[in-house]
């Protein structure tokens, strides 16, 4: 789903008030409802008939410093005979999602948000048929 | 997918400077990537063979402000004839994603991160058979 | 983890009625089927009655008539009513028990019915 734009609206401060020095906001430490784990059935990539395989990427000056991407195994879905039946179509699922990025000069450390799109995993769907003029 | 614990780490500065004053970190304004959008299939949440729904939070004060919510239709998969089939379940699928959450007292404005669990779609899948003794 | 106790099963003679009872904790979700499957000796296990989402409810063509199946959602319980009992009802009855991905099999409770 998408995440819109800022219009630099959200952190800004109160019209009353001064503005931000130097385009910069203060960021508290720790992270709300860190603990919060996400409880899905187990390797439903591997049992969905619009079966995924997951990339790693991995980048030190990001938090998360991991992102899982999923990339479809066929064009198709698997039937129940579990052959490929391109009737039906393996679709991904995508979410607009934030990362933070770390940006530093020596001792000078400061963050920025950055948008990253996610392939999270992949569906069955009846495709769309199209007549080309 | 899981966002690891931040182990207070990434948002540190490197031993040799001195610490990050109150506990708080320079956020600079604007999002990277911002223009970047999802791109996919139109309407696979009722097109798919399990299908769902889409519920939105909104927040104000937490960025973005609106959280979309997926709901699976059914316990089943919707079959060729249209009917649901309860052999084949339709599964949620999680993200574990970054929103920002504002707290403001008058003038003073600052940010924190906040995790949040999203269900993104739905996908068909083949139930693990459990045998309760 | 996901617990299932059965009871209702016994020995009834032909005619009678016999009513079985299933509840399942544990785990519980908004999207669920109960019900229950068969197993006669020498014979694979088959569907007698389930209940998906304490709505819809699919039954055996042999069975039609004769069973019932309900269910109280606050309990997360099923139960399955057997009148008019035949001696072919003799089987091992097994509550299921199914929430997306996953599917619960109780242990099972003997019916036999006597003609």
């Known amino acids: 789903r998408k995440i819109p734009k800022v219009g630099h609206t959200f952190f800004q401060k109160p019209e009353s008030c001064p503005p931000v020095p130097g385009g910069s906001m203060k960021l508290d430490i720790g992270i709300i409802n860190e603990n919060q784990r996400v409880s899905m059935s187990r390797n439903i990539e591997s049992r969905s008939t619009s079966p995924w395989n997951y990339t790693v990427t991995w980048d030190p000056n990001r938090y998360p410093s991991e992102v899982v991407q999923a990339q479809c195994r066929n064009l198709g879905c698997i039937n129940a005979q579990g052959k490929e039946d391109i009737s039906m179509n393996s679709v991904p699922i995508q979410q607009e999602t934030l990362v933070v990025r770390r940006k530093h000069q020596g001792c000078s450390v400061s963050f920025q948000l950055e948008k990253v799109l996610v392939t999270v995993g992949c569906t069955c769907v009846t495709p769309v048929i199209h007549h080309v003029q | 997918r899981k966002i690891p614990k931040v182990g207070h780490t990434f948002f540190q500065k490197p031993e040799s400077c001195p610490p990050v004053p109150g506990g708080s970190m320079k956020l600079d304004i604007g999002i990277i990537n911002e223009n970047q959008r999802v791109s996919m299939s139109r309407n696979i949440e009722s097109r798919s063979t399990s299908p769902w729904n889409y519920t939105v939070t909104w927040d104000p004060n937490r960025y973005p402000s609106e959280v979309v919510q997926a709901q699976c239709r059914n316990l089943g998969c919707i079959n060729a004839q249209g009917k649901e089939d309860i052999s084949m379940n339709s599964v949620p699928i999680q993200q574990e994603t970054l929103v920002v959450r504002r707290k403001h007292q008058g003038c003073s404005v600052s940010f924190q991160l906040e995790k949040v669990l999203v269900t993104v779609g739905c996908t068909c899948v083949t139930p693990v058979i459990h045998h309760v003794q | 983890e996901v617990q299932l106790v059965e009871s209702g099963g016994g020995l009834v003679q032909a005619g009678g009625s016999l009513r079985l009872s299933c509840a399942a904790s544990g785990v519980i979700f908004r999207l669920n089927a109960m019900g229950w499957y068969r197993a006669a000796p020498g014979k694979q296990r088959e569907l007698v009655a389930i209940i998906v989402n304490g709505g819809s409810t699919n039954y055996a063509d042999s069975v039609k008539g004769r069973f019932t199946i309900s269910r109280d959602s606050a309990k997360n319980a099923v139960y399955l009513q057997m009148n008019s009992l035949k001696p072919e009802d003799t089987a091992v009855y097994y509550c299921?028990?199914?929430?997306?991905?996953?599917?619960?099999w109780g242990q099972g409770t003997q019916v036999t019915v006597s003609s």
């Open positions: 299921y028990y199914n929430i997306p991905g996953d599917v619960y």
